[in-house]
Amino acid sequence: YHGCPSECTCSRASQVECTGARIVAVPTPLPWNAMSLQILNTHITELNESPFLNISALIALRIEKNELSRITPGAFRNLGSLRYLSLANNKLQVLPIGLFQGLDSLESLLLSSNQLLQIQPAHFSQCSNLKELQLHGNHLEYIPDGAFDHLVGLTKLNLGKNSLTHISPRVFQHLGNLQVLRLYENRLTDIPMGTFDGLVNLQELALQQNQIGLLSPGLFHNNHNLQRLYLSNNHISQLPPSVFMQLPQLNRLTLFGNSLKELSPGIFGPMPNLRELWLYDNHISSLPDNVFSNLRQLQVLILSRNQISFISPGAFNGLTELRELSLHTNALQDLDGNVFRMLANLQNISLQNNRLRQLPGNIFANVNGLMAIQLQNNQLENLPLGIFDHLGKLCELRLYDNPWRCDSDILPLRNWLLLNQPRLGTDTVPVCFSPANVRGQSLIIINVNVAVPSVHVPEVPSYPETPWYPDTPSYPDTTSVSSTTELTSPVEDYTDLTTIQVTDDRSVWGMTQAQSG
């Protein structure tokens, strides 16, 4: 293959790969017809002048996961055909000016996971054809004005995981073709009005895991093509009324892990494509009427781990397509009988870890397709007659960890549960709390005659005594639609940002946590 260095492997497809700790300099001679060169996991500490001079046909060059800390300005001379250059995962602190000069075909430049302290306009001024620039995982504290002014064709810019404390409103102004901008995991406290105004083709904006406290009202008003907006894990305490008004293409919005105290009606301006809204881990205390009424296509609404104590009867108006509603781990004591009436397509509802002491008899009246109801860890003493009668698809009902009062009033519920045991799961059953003489005994098998009779015995029909069996032959908990462990956050669809964390039973969507925010 026109000579392959002993430390490398060379394939017929003009691909050369050089790996191993024994390599301390760029191997020579490299085959002149190489089109792809990878130098990975070596002990190379510096690149001297023109080590690639004889391989001018090179299209892709990956120099990753080395000890590289110094590069001579002329290191990449004669690589005019190079389209892809990665220097990721090295130890670069400084980029020499003119390093990328002559790389007229360069489209992707990856400088991520180094120790870069600064970038200057002169660094990229020659890279007019660049489409992708990855700078995440460095030590950048600021971006000077003009740094990206020559990169008019750039479509993807990643500045995540740096130490940026502020952004100049002019720094992105010439990036009219930019589609993806990532600024996650920095130290941004606010973003000046106008910062994103020039980004008319932006589709994804990742601002999660900063320290942003306030959003300017018109911050996103020029970003009509925005599809994904990540604002989770910041310090946002309020949302200006018009902040999301001009985002008709938005299909993902994350706001979990902020300090939101309230949501005003119509705050989520027309977003016909939004399917999921993640609002867990905020400080929301109440939900007013029509707060989500513009989200006609919403299918998943996560409001868990807030401080919600009041939900207005019309709070969920407009959510006719909603499939999953998570309200667990809040401070709900009461629910209006009509609060879920509009949710005709609801399948899963989690209400566990609240303070519910009773439920209205009509609470699930119009929600005929419910498949999973989580009511564990509340303060329920009984449930109204026939509350689950019409829920023919119900296959998961969690009622444990409530202070069930096992007097004669509990008989209708006991009888229904007896005939519908598969729905309760096998791991944890509801037990009586009072009277004291039956405390701790299973509600399903309790002999109510032992318990203290209540003052009145209702003379109304009992729960239906039709046994229920699931359609499937087996009934493992793990296949249920909404298990008691829930998906904590959306898995965001870019791999350089996603981190997987497993949490305990305080998780949010009541499966494992794939949290990338």
Epitope: A331, Q333, D334, Q352, N353, R355, R357, Q358, Q376, N377, Q379, Y400, D401, P403, T428, V429, P430, V431, F433, S434, A436, R439, G440, Q441, D505, R506
Partner: antibody
Framework: EVQLVESGGGLVQPGGSLRLSCAVS????????VHWVRQATGKGLEWLGV???????NYNSALMSRLTISKENAKSSVYLQMNSLRAGDTAMYYC??????????????WGQGTTVTVSS | DIVMTQSPDSLAVSLGERATINCKSS????????????LAWYQQKPGQSPKLLIY???TRESGVPDRFSGSGSGTDFTLTISSLQAEDVAVYYC????????FGGGTKVEIK
């Protein structure tokens, strides 16, 4: 006879963690919830959290990020794990349950407590 | 979180006299549907673990002497010891369980 016995206290370095145990007898953890409460010397009572019969947990919101309550029903033991300890966590730690009271969050049986000192 | 404020911090009363302890919550402890106030009183004698005296603002726990009584509504509650006995020397705590429990700061009762 109903009994709750705390153990695992002692001297802990700041920034360290502790794991306290509460061994119960006379009742089953599959039937009763167990609370953890602490009291600094000469100070008031502070509710830390509870694990219910079915395994659900509730926590004091101010301490939630540092606390985990768990249990092993077969061993009749409840555990309190607390991380990132500081001097202010020095206290007597009690476990308690609701044996007879009609108050769901009432605590009518208490252990004698175990002392935790956080100091370098 | 609901904040519970007790007054006074300490109280010296003669044997046989009435002792009154006040507890104020930062929000109402009444659940309108159950019509219960979720407030309890605990007694802690020196060197001992706490003991539950009263729950639901006014329901005495079994075995508690009838000289102990609880009253109040909304946000204001009172524990009364109608005739103080020597064995009543203790610190008394109120506790709300309307939301997740919080205790008051305690009131120390001594003999004058």
């Amino acid at each position: 006879e109903v009994q709750l016995v705390e153990s695992g206290g002692g001297l802990v370095q700041p920034g360290g963690s502790l794991r306290l145990s509460c061994a119960v007898s006379g009742f089953s953890l599959t039937s009763y919830g167990v609370h953890w409460v602490r009291q600094a010397t000469g100070k008031g009572l502070e509710w830390l959290g509870v694990i219910w019969a079915g395994g659900s947990t509730n926590y004091n919101s101010a301490l939630m990020s540092r606390l985990t309550i768990s249990k092993e029903n077969a061993k009749s033991s409840v555990y309190l794990q607390m991380n990132s300890l500081r001097a202010g966590d020095t206290a007597m730690y009690y476990c308690a349950t609701h044996m007879i009271t009609e108050d769901y969050y009432g605590m009518d049986y208490w252990g004698q407590g175990t002392t935790v000192t956080v100091s370098s | 979180d609901i904040v519970m404020t007790q007054s006074p911090d300490s109280l010296a009363v003669s044997l046989g006299e009435r002792a009154t302890i006040n507890c104020k919550s930062s929000q109402s402890l009444l659940n309108s549907r159950t019509r219960k106030h979720y407030l309890a009183w605990y007694q802690q004698k020196p060197g001992q673990s706490p003991k539950l005296l009263i729950y639901w603002a006014s329901t005495r726990e079994s075995g508690v002497p009838d000289r102990f009584s609880g009253s109040g509504s909304g946000t204001d509650f009172t524990l009364t010891i109608s005739s103080l006995q020597a064995e009543d020397v203790a610190v008394y705590y109120c506790k709300q369980s309307y939301n997740l429990p919080t205790f008051g700061g305690g009131t120390k009762v001594e003999i004058k």
